[in-house]
């Protein structure tokens, strides 16, 4: 990718997914009735015409929002602190790296629209998640539903990153 998002960024993303999986505290089978349609903006991560700025912006905003969501008093009360600390550290590292990349991509003249538009969409999506948690009084099941939702959206975003990486490889080898 622009600053050549290295292999270790993909590794960090997968590590975040592993941590989110390990954070599970109750059986999701107990929480079926708490499911909610958060309307993850799939169109943002499914396109075939992927711009570097767009991909980085989506990843950056996703990680920033996940960091914020899991960096609250409510979150600290809900999750294992050791795993939560590891999650914070991993997200912080990824965010630092993405910020460096985004500066470089903007310096290369990629459209600012490709950066601001996904950010706004994702903020709305995460706001819906926050409203849901409040509505459900931050219950164990509500957090479990949110944990699964974040895993799904992060998985889709990481896939988008992998697609761009393989597109770059194809261009490089042709």
């Amino acid at each position: 990718l622009g600053c050549d998002l290295p292999q270790n960024h993909g590794l960090l993303s997968r590590n975040t997914l592993v941590l989110l999986h390990q954070m599970r505290r109750i059986s999701p089978f107990l929480c079926l009735k708490d499911r909610r349609d958060f309307r993850f903006p799939q169109e943002m991560v499914k396109g075939s015409q992927l711009q570097k700025a767009h991909v980085m912006s989506v990843l950056h905003e996703m990680l920033q929002q996940i960091f914020s969501l899991f960096h609250t008093e409510r979150s600290s009360a809900a999750w294992n602190m050791t795993l939560l600390d590891q999650l914070h550290t991993g997200l912080h590292q990824q965010l630092q790296h993405l910020e460096t990349c985004l500066l470089q991509v903007v310096g290369e003249g990629e459209s600012a629209g490709a950066i601001s538009s996904p950010a706004l969409t994702l903020r709305r999506y995460f706001q819906g998640i926050r409203v849901y948690l409040k509505e459900k009084k931050y219950s164990d099941c509500a957090w479990e539903v949110v944990r699964m939702e974040i895993m799904k959206s992060l998985f889709l975003s990481t896939n988008m990153q992998e697609r761009l990486r393989s597109k770059d490889r194809d261009l490089g080898s042709s």
Epitope: P28, F29, L32
Partner: antibody, heavy 121, light 107 residues
Framework: EVQLVQSGAEVKKPGESLKISCKGS????????IGWVRQMPGKGLEWMGI????????RYSPSFQGQVTISADKSISTAYLQWSSLKASDTAMYYC??????????????WGQGTLVTVSS | DIQMTQSPSSLSASVGDRVTITCRAS??????LNWYQQKPGKAPKLLIY???SLQSGVPSRFSGSGSGTDFTLTISSLQPEDFATYYC?????????FGQGTKVEIK
């Protein structure tokens, strides 16, 4: 293309053991739960139980608790349904189907083709 | 356990007819209700999920409605390939339960 492929038909005697399988492909196997459904000859659908292949957490219908065991091997994207001692009343078609777990997506959107189990002396 | 009761248990209809099948839950299940179609010797096929969402690839003549305890599956204009058995199923809570089925036969 998402597929759930089940093992072939089985003919067994009462008291014998059996393990049938359901192999998932074309999707992230650990992102969905796998449910098992029984259909006795000429009858309706009965939910038996469900497994989360990511960590093998399992829940059974009270009617099937202790009668069958559901398991999964995520390394080969396969779920299993097994009996330690079959009865004639276990004669039925058994289906596996995938479930999105807590994610907002269609329930049981893909089904295996079914495994016919016949138990007769 | 949540009991699911379908009615009628069978019905005879002609091609082009409007067909309605109802499903009642023994307690409120919000909109966690799915409808399946099953043809002899085949696996069930998902038609409607979350009470009213049409599954991808399913013809628009199928529709679902309802919430709470009372639900309906409607086939607006019955086609020859629609003669089958239809099941409702709740996924509001475990154990997951199915209705007993409604067989739609040719008049």
């Amino acid at each position: 293309e998402v597929q759930l492929v089940q093992s072939g038909a089985e003919v067994k005697k009462p008291g014998e053991s059996l393990k049938i399988s359901c192999k998932g492909s074309g999707y992230s196997f650990t992102s969905y739960w796998i449910g098992w459904v029984r259909q006795m000859p000429g009858k309706g659908l009965e939910w038996m139980g469900i497994i989360d292949p990511s960590d093998s957490d399992t829940r059974y219908s009270p009617s099937f608790q202790g009668q069958v065991t559901i398991s999964a091997d995520k390394s080969i994207s396969t779920a299993y349904l097994q009996w330690s001692s079959l009865k004639a009343s276990d004669t039925a078609m058994y289906y596996c189907a995938r479930h999105p777990g807590l994610n907002w997506a269609p329930d049981f959107d893909y089904w295996g083709q079914g495994t016919l189990v016949t138990v007769s002396s | 356990d949540i009991q699911m009761t379908q009615s009628p248990s069978s019905l005879s209809a002609s091609v082009g007819d409007r067909v309605t099948i109802t499903c009642r839950a023994s307690q409120s299940i919000s909109s966690f209700l799915n409808w399946y179609q099953q043809k002899p010797g085949k696996a069930p096929k998902l038609l409607i999920y979350y009470a009213s969402s049409l599954q991808s690839g399913v013809p628009s003549r199928f529709s679902g409605s309802g919430s709470g305890t009372d639900f309906t599956l409607t086939i607006s204009s019955l086609q020859p390939e629609d003669f089958a058995t239809y099941y409702c199923q709740q996924s509001y809570d475990l154990p997951i339960t199915f209705g007993q089925g409604t067989k739609v036969e040719i008049k």
